[in-house]
């Protein structure tokens, strides 16, 4: 393709300001908002390259990557439009190559600015800026080992770019991965560079390799899938937890409950309470009050600990950690003993609202 580098101009009129170089119709690179744009500096013997945008020095940042002779803008926005230049500094002289960047949606008049993800590589349609495949989002590829419970969905990703746009194929244990190799087949979303397998089974275990290639090169990445067979059991609670506790009036106490469950567990802390002087209702079931359950601001780790602050005598009694999943329910109980604080009378507190379960 034409180099469009600057050439020395010997035909300048006297009234023009003296300049060494004259732009000869710079190449225009067009990208849609949110896409990634990569440009190669077309200068020969470029040992040291510096970049400018609209005459201002351009350095690397979280969206601008400068590697050797390549400039990559990730997640382009209209603000990235402008006149760019790369300058090659040599021992004898320097040479500059200019190009335009226009970030706009070709159809939409340029206000489609919300595609801020820069996962797709973009290369000017009219350019010969050929490039072998490369990864565009290695963060999505960091987790190589996937240990997945049976019946879950698993997704492997290999987001890539290149020019021409590379193709993607998948191997299982080094061999071509065909739809008939697994019951139910699998899904490939080329636009997302992803392989999706639903309802995985033990026979899906193995190494999965994406091969991304075009006429200029090939790259690959391997994931290891381990399928963990589900244990059909109710939650397991760690022995000895929660443990009996004692504290003085006004003190703080905590009960800990460690829950192990393959299926998603639901955890509750319950206090055994009295109603009209009785611990049990007419049906023989105990009166219970739910103190804490997984909710809007509670993580699994937080629900495993029950904190009781500024303890009163009313807090004394039996506390139960109850965990249930789709298979069944398990519970462990512990007792809180409240001792009188030195020199403090027994406190009288109002009865709470009780919940019969």
């Amino acid at each position: 393709r034409p180099s469009f580098s600057l050439v020395e101009d010997t035909t300048l009129e006297p009234e023009e300001p003296p300049t060494k170089y004259q732009i000869s119709q710079p190449e225009v690179y067009v990208a849609a908002p949110g896409e990634s744009l990569e440009v190669r500096c077309l200068l020969k013997d470029a040992a040291v390259i510096s970049w400018t945008k609209d005459g201002v020095h351009l350095g690397p940042n979280n969206r601008t990557v400068l590697i050797g002779e390549y400039l990559q803008i990730k997640g382009a926005t209209p603000r990235d439009s402008g006149l760019y230049a790369c300058t090659a500094s040599r021992t004898v002289d320097s040479e500059t190559w200019y190009f335009m960047v226009n970030v706009t949606d070709a159809i939409s008049s340029g206000d489609d600015e919300d595609d801020t993800d820069g996962a797709e590589d973009f290369v000017s349609e009219n350019s010969n800026n050929k490039r072998a495949p490369y990864w565009t989002n290695t963060e999505k590829m960091e987790k190589r080992l996937h240990a997945v419970p049976a019946a879950n969905t698993v997704k492997f990703r290999c987001p890539a770019g290149g020019n021409p746009m590379p193709t993607m194929r998948w191997l299982k244990n080094g061999k071509e991965f065909k739809q008939e190799h697994r019951i139910g087949g699998y899904k490939v979303r080329n636009q997302h560079w992803s392989l999706i397998m639903e309802s995985v089974v033990p026979s899906d275990k193995g190494n999965y390799t994406c091969v991304v290639e075009n006429e200029y090169g090939s790259i690959n990445h391997t994931y290891h899938l381990d399928v963990v067979e589900r244990s059909p059991h109710r939650p397991i609670l760690q022995a000895g937890l929660p443990a009996n506790a004692s504290t003085v009036v006004g003190g703080d106490v905590e009960f800990v409950c460690k829950v192990y469950s393959d299926a998603q567990p639901h955890i509750q802390w319950i206090k055994h309470v009295e109603k009209n002087g009785s611990k049990y209702g007419p049906d023989g079931l105990p009166y219970l009050k739910v103190l804490k359950a997984a909710g809007v601001n509670t993580t699994d780790k937080e629900i495993e600990v029950l904190y009781i602050r500024n303890v009163t005598f009313e807090d004394a009694g039996e506390y139960t950690c109850l965990a249930g999943n789709s298979i069944g329910i398990s519970f462990h109980s512990a007792w809180l003993t409240v001792l009188p604080a030195p020199g403090r009378e027994k406190e009288i507190t109002a009865s709470p609202d009780y919940l019969e379960i």
Partner: antibody
């Protein structure tokens, strides 16, 4: 400016058929995956189906599999949903939505078209 | 299919309040989660994509966090125009299931 405009909704009897259209403008249609999402009156959102930009990939919610077909005509910038064997529970506002590049988030939605299945 | 469970199903809050909505997936979905806002009679609007990325044009008082199975949408200081229904949506599996929604009402 990105625009999505659904049409084709209306009243249909159980067991009947309907074809929804979604006319897209303001972006390079073939570059984007598109989805249909529906919302029954007073209920939440339910994803229905997706189709890749070049039409090479489609997928459906279990509730419509075998009855609905998603397709697109990139030369006309139009997305379609062919709905057969309609049931009362298919009554909903149907939205077409554009997927963001790579992330499968729906960044643009149409205004919706109401499909009522009733005898 | 992957189930998405939102909590709470509704909440009452005042202007200026900090509001938190959670979404739990029935399996690990990495960071493949989006959040939407919907007002009566209107189409949904994308707020957050891929768990924590703020969609262009969305006020910075909205933020998202989480990965794996537990995700959170936070509105740092509730504004009058924020009273709406909020939905989470996973895109890890081919079926992009939504949560059942959380209605944020005026106290």
């Amino acid at each position: 400016q990105v625009q999505l405009l659904e049409s084709g909704g209306g009243l249909v009897q159980p067991g009947g058929s309907l074809r929804l259209s979604c006319a897209a403008s303001g972006f390079t249609f073939s570059d984007y995956a598109m989805s249909w999402v529906r919302q029954a009156p007073g209920k939440g959102l339910e994803w229905v189906s997706v189709i890749e930009g070049d039409g090479s990939y489609t997928h459906y919610a279990d509730s419509v599999k075998g009855r609905f077909t998603i397709s697109r005509d990139n030369s006309k910038n139009t997305l379609y949903l062919q709905m057969n064997s309609l049931r009362a529970e298919d009554t909903a506002v149907y939205y077409c939505a554009r997927e963001k590049t790579y992330s499968s988030a729906f960044d643009y939605w149409g205004q919706g078209t109401l499909v009522t299945v009733s005898s | 299919d992957i189930q998405m469970t939102q909590s709470p199903s509704s909440l009452s809050a005042s202007v200026g309040d900090r509001v938190t909505i959670t979404c739990r997936a029935s399996q690990d979905i990495s960071s493949d989660l989006n959040w939407y806002q919907q007002k009566p009679g209107k189409a949904p609007k994308l707020l957050i994509y891929d768990a924590s990325n703020l969609q262009s044009g969305v006020p910075s008082r909205f933020s998202g966090s989480g990965s794996g199975t537990d995700f959170t949408l936070t509105i740092s200081s509730l504004q009058p125009e924020d009273f709406a229904v909020y939905y989470c949506q996973q895109h890890y599996s081919p079926s992009h299931t939504f949560g059942q929604g959380t209605k944020v009402e005026i106290k």
